[in-house]
Amino acid sequence: AGYVFRDKVMSEFNNNFRQQMENYPKNNHTASILDRMQADFKCCGAANYTDWEKIPSMSKNRVPDSCCINVTVGCGINFNEKAIHKEGCVEKIGGWLRKNV
């Protein structure tokens, strides 16, 4: 039962995270939550950083600045892969949840 519940939580978190990405950066509240998660957990996107390419408001050459290894304003623009966190947040935060919840 515990495993089923954990999988359900992970699935919900994944869906919710991707939903919030769709609103980035239009919704300031959403943006600040996602930015905080990405910066704190050193992750980028749901599965990985390429998820941001699919977001209409984000150009192909851009990720949120919170994905950068060294976060500064604009660092997500024209990024190179070595300058950003490539791991996805769902797996990274999920791992933390599994350990701590």
């Epitope: 950066p25 150009s59 192909k60 500064t72 304003v73 604009g74 623009i77 024209n78 190179n80 300058a83």
Partner: antibody, heavy 120, light 113 residues
Framework: QVQLQESGPELVKPGASVKMSCKAS????????IHWVKQKPGQGLEWIGY????????KYNERFKGKATLTSDRSSSTAYMELSSLTSEDSAVYYC?????????????WGQGTSVTVSS | DIWMTQSPSSLAVSPGEKVTMNCKSS????????????LAWYQQKPGQSPKLLIY????RESGVPDRFTGSGGSGTDFTLTISNIQTEDLAVYYC????????FGGGTKLELK
Amino acid sequence: QVQLQESGPELVKPGASVKMSCKASGYTFTTYVIHWVKQKPGQGLEWIGYFDPNNDGTKYNERFKGKATLTSDRSSSTAYMELSSLTSEDSAVYYCARSRTYYDASMDYWGQGTSVTVSS
Amino acid sequence: DIWMTQSPSSLAVSPGEKVTMNCKSSQSVLYSSNQKNFLAWYQQKPGQSPKLLIYWASTRESGVPDRFTGSGGSGTDFTLTISNIQTEDLAVYYCQQIFSSYTFGGGTKLELK
């Protein structure tokens, strides 16, 4: 003072490769990104790609993926660009230029350019 | 991709005149996080490398005379104004967006009347 010294002109045969250099001086090499820009005779400027000496990261214009390879040698503060499978379309002047970062990418210092002529 | 369109392609001027050239981007280059337009202007004289004049659409590079002024806050429409034109200003002027990859406009050539 800041200088970007590029290698001399190249006359190469179609199908061959060429590697040009850009030696930086007057600043800390790893704190600036090196961009490469193409200019065909009598035409405008076209961005090829950048090399970030801080993390060896690269970014290419889609049009130049597979054509250009960007590298550097930190010990000599030199950036390199290799162009492969050359055709007459690659005949141009190639500039290296630096920018503070890849995102604040206004290019404040430029090399003098390397002229590449592809001819049999 | 973001495309940059410059107009006019050439301008005939006399010394002392004031000229304005335009640069239009196909998408906004305004970054909401810092409210800066990621656009630069360059000057290229015959046989020389390009020289940076303006960055962030309106900030003059150090050493550039204040006769050169960049403006445009819409995110898509930008202008470079040169007042009291000198003969040494005869050159090709390029705008460049830095917001999504890097693309240059086709240039505006400043010639003597």
